[in-house]
């Protein structure tokens, strides 16, 4: 069974998948479609790196540009380094600028919805 066939079988169970499962899935060549990706739990998507999302979505990663104003895509973009976003070749903007340090202050983030940044 290839990655795409595997994805079809598990698609209906993915809604509540934790980050760890999504990271594991990104190694399986599943090419998750964007509609399924956007139904995932936001808190599970946010910790994923650009490389992991690229592997998870495969060719469908291109659709992030078309859906950049919708959650969880919008929130995920805000969490990524701009340099990493640039590798997607989509012209996505809003990532963390080069030279900034991300502080994982979960209370601050829970209140504001955005990560806390320290300038260069």
């Amino acid at each position: 069974m290839n990655g795409s066939e595997y994805f079809v079988k598990i698609q209906s169970f993915l809604g509540g998948a934790p980050t760890e499962d999504l990271k594991a899935l990104s190694q399986q060549n599943v090419s998750m479609d964007l509609a399924t990706f956007m139904k995932l739990r936001t808190d599970a998507v946010l910790p994923l790196t650009v490389a992991e999302v690229q592997k998870l979505l495969g060719p469908h990663v291109e659709g992030l540009k078309a859906e950049e104003r919708h959650r969880p895509v919008r929130d995920w973009i805000l969490r990524q380094r701009q340099d990493d976003l640039d590798t997607l070749g989509l012209g996505l903007q809003g990532g963390i600028p080069n030279g900034y340090l991300v502080l994982d202050l979960s209370m601050q983030e829970a209140l504001s919805g955005t990560p806390c940044l320290l300038g260069p």
Epitope: S31, K39, Q54, E62
Partner: antibody, heavy 117, light 113 residues
Amino acid sequence: EVQLVQSGAEVKKPGASVKVSCKASGYTFTNYWMHWVRQAPGQGLEWMGNINPSSGDSYYNERFMSRVTMTVDKSTSTVYMELSSLRSEDTAVYYCARSGGLWLAFWGQGTLVTVSS
Amino acid sequence: DIVMTQSPDSLAVSLGERATINCKSSQTLLNSVSQNNYLAWYQQKPGQSPTLLIYFASTRESGVPDRFSGSGSGTDFTLTISSLQAEDVAVYYCQQHYRTPYTFGGGTKVEIK
């Protein structure tokens, strides 16, 4: 003004390979993916695959997986599509098309590839 | 693969009259989160490359005349030309961009009656 200029028509023998180029201008080359679509004479459109011009990552329609290779040259804002082991049914017009998000917003003029012994 | 079925295969319409083209997909093209339908319409005039008319099922591409409109959701979609002009003679294709391989309908040829 966005422009996609493709290489000229080719005539190839069965079993040979063909490499079609698509030179882009009028926009930031690394901000938009490029797709390849073909159209056999008098027939409809068939998606072959797409490529991320920033990283060079490419994805192919499984129908062509073993025979197609898409590459990019950022220095000249050019993408390439190579199709190997050509057969007569590969005779078609091959188009490059720039993505607008997922849809194909701009198309090249097309390159006719004729496969004949 | 998602199968796209267009109807009719060809259509002859008088100048100034309405032309309606249907496109049906074998599975939903709706993103239930964003409410976007991943369907595009293209026009291909004789001897030319295709051009984009509509994306997200109903969003008209910049520069496309407002006589062209797209509608539908899920699996059933329609392209309407409200008042056919001579320059609209072409083949029209729908395409899904929900899941690879992105697939096209077989095309509908629109002619003047």
